[in-house]
């Protein structure tokens, strides 16, 4: 932004500048250019020997200016365009200034003036241009400063040129008031802080309903000597409930919200929320719908799932495989997990209790993501009831639970308890036992064994007794051994797999249990 202190051309000849010597040299004249009257100060004493003609402006109040810019528009005639070349003719003039705290009026003293520069034209007006009224206008700009007094004068010294001053414009520069990144920067006088620091740092203030982001830098701009803003640092963001519209922050419309200070616009209230009011920072959930603590406010409100579908319990001796399908209503969420609980009842007494401690699950029964699980180590002649509950991220916000149950009766034998009776370098003697009450139901026992690490082959031995010797084994080798009762109903519960090791040929191996 340029703040003009003096504009000769704009004054339409009404500025009465002082000429020295009076009545000679510089002269105010009017001309017609582009069908418009223009005024100029002109001098053309090119054949009268040495010249020293001065033209002084009126006193100019400095205002806030520290450095002023002087823009001159002028024309200079070619000395060769005059007959005989006009031997005393010059093609330059001198620019001066003087500072003062008061207007000296018509009291003009050359010694008070300091030379700014010799002003020379880039283009001179040759005869053909003059004749054709082609004004070869030159534009020169000079900077003066720092100024310290209340005002100043400019003066133009003619030393024998044929020159016309068409425009004298004096101005200083300001960086204009500006809105940038939602920050308002005040109008700032363009000054160099120092030669090494040609930029003035200016702090901005956030516009209404805008804030400096948390942990961010406040808005700063740099005002150059040329009155231009440079290098913005930091920014302001529209606060929660407001969005950026051009250079302002506007409240979110009803039905929209914004939860934090950011560059993003207001978002439409998501599904299953109540319509928000103007300037909302969030949208409340409809009744029966919830938000998990980790859910973003932009996410739809959700509800707990319905119970799992089609729960089935398939008994396999002392094991049960539970299978189910996902709930029909997921509540609008993907984070569904399942938990399985177990209850056992004694048929004789009808007494029931939890059985988590006595059964084994194929994977932890809480926070299951798959839709099946195998439960083993079930006791025979026992009734089991399994409950599968579906949960999601908002289930914890309600007291009701969504589960389905399935019951199964176990007629299976208890798994045999196996131990190593004896061993040699090539044999293992294994014994086992089962409760007396179940022995009458066992038809035979099946012993399965294989070398540890060899998954491709195994051996099976059947016996009616409670022991077996496994021969033809390799020395110093670990074998995996399992015993399973065979009943009329099929396979009974299998023992756990035991690791037993034959003796080494040196006979120095330990017995493994």
């Amino acid at each position: 932004k340029e703040v003009v202190l003096l504009d000769f051309a704009a004054m339409k000849g009404e500025l009465g500048w002082l000429t020295h010597p009076y009545g000679k040299g510089w002269d105010l004249m009017q001309n017609i250019m582009d069908d418009m009257p223009i005024y100029m100060y002109s001098v053309c004493n090119v054949v009268s020997g040495d010249q020293d003609n001065w033209l002084r402006t009126n006193w100019v109040y400095r205002e806030e200016a520290e450095r002023i810019f002087i823009e001159l528009k002028f024309t200079v005639r070619d000395c060769n365009s005059f007959p005989g070349g006009a031997s005393s003719c010059k093609e330059t003039f001198n620019l001066y200034y003087a500072e003062s705290d008061v207007d000296y009026g018509t009291n003009f003293q050359k010694r008070q003036f300091t030379k700014i520069d010799t002003i020379a034209p880039d283009e001179i007006t040759v005869s053909s241009d003059f004749e054709a009224r082609n004004v070869k206008l030159n534009v020169e700009e000079r900077m003066v400063g720092p100024l310290t007094r209340k005002g100043f004068y400019l003066a133009f010294q003619d030393i024998g040129a044929c020159v016309a001053l068409l425009s004298v414009r004096v101005y200083y520069k300001k960086c204009p008031e500006m809105l940038q990144s939602l920050a308002r920067f005040p109008e700032t006088i363009a000054v160099a802080v120092s030669d090494t620091q040609p930029l003035a740092t200016v702090a901005g203030t956030c516009v209404d309903h805008a804030v400096v982001p948390y942990g961010g830098e406040g808005p700063l701009m740099h005002c150059t000597v040329d009155g231009e803003w440079l290098v913005p640092i930091g920014q302001c963001l529209c606060q929660e409930g407001y969005e950026k519209v051009e250079d302002a922050c506007r409240a979110c419309s009803p039905g929209f919200f914004k939860s934090e200070a950011s560059e993003s616009p207001c978002l439409e209230c998501p599904e299953h929320t109540l319509p928000s009011t103007e300037g909302a920072t969030s949208c409340q959930c409809e009744e029966g719908y919830f938000r998990a603590p980790e859910d973003p406010l932009s996410m739809s409100c959700t509800r707990p799932p319905s119970a799992p579908n089609y729960l089935t319990a398939i008994g396999m001796g002392a094991k049960v495989e539970l299978r189910w399908t996902a709930p029909k209503d997921t509540g609008g969420r993907q984070d569904i997990v399942y938990s399985v609980t177990c209850e056992q009842c004694w048929p004789e007494s009808g007494e029931c209790g939890p059985c988590e401690a006595s059964v084994r699950y194929s994977e932890p029964p809480h926070a299951l993501t798959r839709t099946s699980v195998t439960v083993s180590d079930l006791e025979p002649h026992m009734n089991y009831t399994f409950a599968v509950e579906a949960r999601n991220g908002v289930s914890g916000l309600v007291t009701s639970r969504s589960f389905r149950t399935a019951s199964v009766s176990i007629n299976q034998t208890e798994p045999p308890k196996v131990r190593l009776e004896d061993r040699s370098t090539t044999s293992l003697s294994v014994t086992w036992s089962i409760p007396v009450s179940q022995q009458s139901r066992v038809w035979k026992y099946e012993v399965t064994y294989r070398k540890k690490g060899d998954a491709n082959s195994y051996n099976v031995r059947r016996t009616e007794g409670f022991s077996v010797t496994l021969d033809d084994l390799a020395p110093d080798t670990t074998y995996l051994v399992q015993v399973q009762a065979l009943t009329q109903e099929g396979q009974g519960a299998g023992s756990k797999v035991h690791e037993f090791q034959t003796l080494s040929t040196e006979g120095s191996a330990n017995m493994a249990v």
Partner: antibody, heavy 128, light 107 residues
Framework: EVQLLESGGGLVQPGGSLRLSCAAS????????MAWVRQAPGKGLEWVSR????????HYADSVKGRFTISRDNSKNTLYLQMNSLRAEDTAVYYC?????????????????????WGQGTLVTVSS | DIQMTQSPSSLSASVGDRVTITCRAS??????LAWYQQKPGKAPKLLIY???NLHTGVPSRFSGSGSGTEFSLTISGLQPDDFATYYC?????????FGQGTKVEIK
């Protein structure tokens, strides 16, 4: 020394035509703006027409516009005025005049010109 | 067109007198004014241009002044060779108009 010598004047009937010439010498003719100025018997001066140094632009007084044509031949150092549809009020002494910007000691040329050099004139009489 | 009015139309003066002729323009012409001298049967001669600039070879007893609409030609110390008719001419517009003339006669 600058010399301008008009010729071609004489008696002509109303509606008739005449061509005036102005022979120039003693200066660089192609640098000068040239003009015709007339003076009716016992009256003041009246500007008629002008032509630029290289043949343009041309200007005419309203009283002669459309009837008179100014031209020049720089190779012959001669200025012309072709006068058609002559009227009785065109009776006057016709002067050829010149202006050289080199003798105009001003920084910016005036909107038009004045006349630094004049010929002795030639009389044109329009009468039946 | 710009009208130029001279006054007086004629005047009688003696050798050595100071004579002033005025010229008024119907609208402002800045300083775009010339003065000419014409003797009977002769062509006009340029005296002054741009209101106050003396043409080459013109005696310094002739001077011009004024701007806008009011102009004057002054002969300080009239000489026998100065008895003639004087015309002003504006060249602020392309219609370069002359005043009607002022005749300076011997008293």
């Amino acid at each position: 020394e600058v010399q301008l010598l008009e010729s071609g004047g004489g008696l002509v009937q109303p509606g008739g035509s005449l061509r005036l010439s102005c022979a120039a010498s003693g200066f660089t003719f192609s640098h000068y703006m040239m003009a015709w100025v007339r003076q009716a018997p016992g009256k003041g001066l009246e500007w008629v027409s002008r032509i630029g140094p290289s043949g343009g632009p041309t200007h005419y007084a309203d009283s002669v516009k459309g009837r008179f044509t100014i031209s020049r031949d720089n190779s012959k150092n001669t200025l012309y005025l072709q006068m058609n549809s002559l009227r009785a009020e065109d009776t006057a002494v016709y002067y050829c005049a010149g202006y050289d910007s080199g003798y105009d000691y001003v920084a910016v040329a005036g909107p038009a010109e004045y006349f630094q050099h004049w010929g002795q004139g030639t009389l044109v009489t329009v009468s039946s | 067109d710009i009208q130029m009015t001279q006054s007086p139309s004629s005047l009688s003066a003696s050798v050595g007198d100071r004579v002033t002729i005025t010229c008024r323009a119907s609208q402002s012409i800045s300083t775009w004014l010339a003065w000419y001298q014409q003797k009977p049967g002769k062509a006009p001669k340029l005296l002054i241009y741009k209101a106050s600039n003396l043409h080459t070879g013109v005696p310094s007893r002739f001077s011009g002044s004024g701007s806008g609409t009011e102009f004057s030609l002054t002969i300080s110390g009239l000489q026998p060779d100065d008895f003639a008719t004087y015309y002003c001419q504006q060249y602020n517009s392309y219609s370069r108009t002359f005043g009607q003339g002022t005749k300076v006669e011997i008293k």
